[in-house]
């Protein structure tokens, strides 16, 4: 095997926002760094066969299978996939290696299978085998992280039982409110499972894998904050762990914290306390209440008390299964062409929802914001004043919710006309839906003022295009109007629009729009 070439097989994953992929089969532009697929000689095979490591690809991903051949002289090649021959154009890189590429755009089931590459060099012939399969993401899961106390240590472990194994990170913030947004400079991220610094203002744990990112906030009552008018509410499902942190700061150590559930002190083993001095020598105490696996009877008011602070409570509600509470009645809106407007849905849900806004078969990202009263809100403002039907869809592990909105844009009608041998029709999408008039233009009525009432048939909202109503009016042709110009006019409270049609014998009809 002295004269066997040195072969390298690589996989290049392309970022899917990369519109350049596929413009040139040789050089897709933006990509991840190549992944070495090994390419080992297959033993006991007739002829020289190299086998690359199996490739698993996500649905819709774009990849390049690439072979680098270090052999003297020219090479020729041929790809074979499912008994079809595919064109192959080798080129040479800067190190004078032969490079052969196969680009697979937007991977589908039909593109999965064995790709055979036959290479002929001056010295020898050989075959390279790639096996490409679609990654079975049905087996993938991404579960919301939960907390556990670390054995014999005052620390929390963050756990997310997900496949593939997720990367776990703590997201910490020490300021209040808006400044704790994900990308704020006040936010610190720690890519580790165990957290010892538990005194921060806002503590979240996030887990991410191929399916996305899920986070859980450590539910906190801060006794130094003024008691809210609405009690914070925490939902959990039976069997989930409960963690509530009570935090208080005082000028000295002369205070203690206690947890009560429905006026009864929590049992030993269901809480632990930590204290520290802050930089200005004030004392910070935190007291955790926890239940490793909640049951229905853990529902109730959990009250954290201190001799030096107003006590505060949270209502913990244990449910059998998740829910999404919101009004699903459809809503209709009518706005002006330049009016600022957002759709909004207010809901209470557990576990947290995943949601989308859809218009005209196109999905838009959905953001949700928590309100003080335990509700969340999702707004959609990116409608670009396009009338039609907008759909909000939300789901979590246990529930689904859909709400329909109709957006009407107030505008003057625009008229389109079409004609056949027997009739003329006019269409308009103005809003409010227009009324119609037909007028005949003749020597007696050069300004087209002679109204036509016979043979007119109006249909309001006969065609719904993604929720956008279209009104039409049809004039049946009679001998009395054949050969004349007629004018159809649509009018509503915002104005009038007309189009003139020449009713001659069959053939193309000229239309004269006249607004």
């Amino acid at each position: 095997n002295q004269d066997l070439p040195v072969i390298k097989c690589v996989l290049i994953n392309h970022k899917n926002n990369d519109s350049s992929v596929g413009k040139s089969s040789s050089y897709p532009m933006v990509s991840e760094s190549p992944e070495d697929l090994g390419c080992a000689l297959r033993p006991q095979s007739s002829g020289t066969v190299y086998e690359a490591a199996a490739v698993e690809v996500d649905v819709s991903a774009s990849i390049t299978l690439q072979v680098l051949v270090d052999a003297p002289g020219n090479i020729s090649c041929l790809w074979v996939f499912k008994h079809s021959s595919l064109n192959c154009q080798p080129h040479f890189d800067l190190q004078n290696r032969g490079v052969v590429s196969m680009v697979i755009l937007k991977m589908t089931e039909t593109q999965a299978g064995e790709y055979l590459l036959f290479i002929q060099s001056e010295a020898t012939n050989y075959t390279i085998l790639f096996t490409v399969s679609i990654r079975n993401t049905l087996l993938y899961t991404l579960r919301r992280p939960y907390f556990r106390k670390m054995e014999n240590q005052d620390a929390l472990v963050c756990i997310s039982e997900s496949v593939p194994e997720p990367i776990v990170e703590w997201v910490l913030c020490d300021s209040q409110g808006e400044s704790c947004k994900e990308e704020s400079p006040a936010v610190v991220k720690k890519e580790e499972k165990v957290l010892h610094e538990l005194f921060g203002t806002d503590i979240r744990c996030c887990a991410r894998n191929e399916l996305g990112r899920e986070c859980t906030r450590l539910f906190t009552i801060d006794l130094n904050q003024t008691p809210q008018t609405t009690l914070p509410q925490l939902f959990l499902k039976v069997g989930e762990p409960l963690w509530i942190r009570c935090k208080a700061v005082h000028v000295n150590h002369g205070f203690g914290l206690t947890w009560e559930l429905e006026n009864k002190a929590l049992e030993e083993g269901n809480y632990f306390e930590m204290s520290t001095y802050s930089t200005n020598r004030t004392m910070i105490r935190i007291l955790f209440a926890f239940v490793s696996s909640v049951a229905r009877n853990d529902t109730g008011y959990y009250t954290c008390s201190s001799s030096k602070h107003p006590s505060q409570s949270a209502l913990v509600t244990i449910v059998e299964k998740g829910f999404i509470n919101a009004t699903n009645s459809s809503e209709d809106y009518e706005i002006d062409q330049y009016e600022e407007f957002c759709f909004s849905v207010r809901f209470k849900a557990y576990p947290q929802i995943r949601c989308t806004w859809t218009f005209s078969r196109k999905s838009f990202p959905c953001e949700q914001k928590g309100l003080d009263n335990g509700y969340s809100i999702s707004k959609f403002c990116n409608h670009k004043h396009q009338p039609g039907e907008y759909i909000f869809h939300a789901e979590n592990d246990d529930a689904q919710f859909t709400k329909m909105f109709t957006l009407n844009i107030r505008r003057k009608p625009q008229v389109l006309a079409e004609a056949s041998a027997s009739q003329a029709s006019c269409f308009s999408d103005g809003y409010p839906l227009p009324s119609w008039t037909w007028k005949k233009c003749s020597d007696k009525s050069p300004n087209c003022t002679e109204e036509i009432t016979e043979g007119v048939w109006n249909r309001k909202a006969n065609r719904k295009v993604f929720g956008q109503w279209v009104s039409s009016s049809t004039l049946n042709m009679s001998e009395a109007i054949k050969g004349f110009l007629v004018k159809c006019c649509a009018y509503n409270s915002l104005g009038t629009s007309c189009e003139t049609i020449l009713l001659n014998s069959p053939g193309p009809f000229p239309f004269i729009q006249d607004n």
Partner: nanobody
Framework: QVQLQESGGGLVQAGGSLRLSCAAS????????IDWYRQAPGKQREWVAQ???????HYEPSLKGRFTISRDNAKNTAYLQMNSLKPEDTAVYYC?????WGQGTQVTVSS
């Protein structure tokens, strides 16, 4: 369920005093803490004072010294003694236990 009923509000001149009562009934307990809140016309509801089950008291800092909260566990009633009243104390006063609220009692301070 807990029911709360405030009383003792009324019209008083600036500098005067009033004593509000909050009577609790239903499944309440002397171990519950009690809060007083108030809401002036066109403003958000704000916290005034709290008495804990052990009798510890806490006040909105700007009201400390003029207002005093107390409780009588035998009668299941909390009180808010308001002295040196000012026109800006005009509001509806509410008591709260956990997530339960009373209907409120109107306090009007005239100048």
């Amino acid at each position: 369920q807990v029911q709360l009923q405030e009383s003792g509000g009324g019209l008083v001149q600036a500098g005067g005093s009033l004593r509000l009562s909050c009577a609790a009934s239903g499944s309440t307990s002397s171990r519950n803490y009690i809060d007083w809140y108030r809401q002036a016309p066109g403003k958000q509801r704000e916290w005034v004072a709290q008495i804990t089950s052990g009798g510890n008291t806490h006040y909105e800092p700007s009201l400390k010294g003029r207002f005093t909260i107390s409780r009588d566990n035998a009668k299941n009633t909390a009180y808010l003694q308001m002295n040196s009243l000012k026109p800006e104390d005009t509001a509806v006063y509410y008591c709260r236990i956990l997530d339960y609220w009373g209907q409120g009692t109107q306090v009007t301070v005239s100048s």
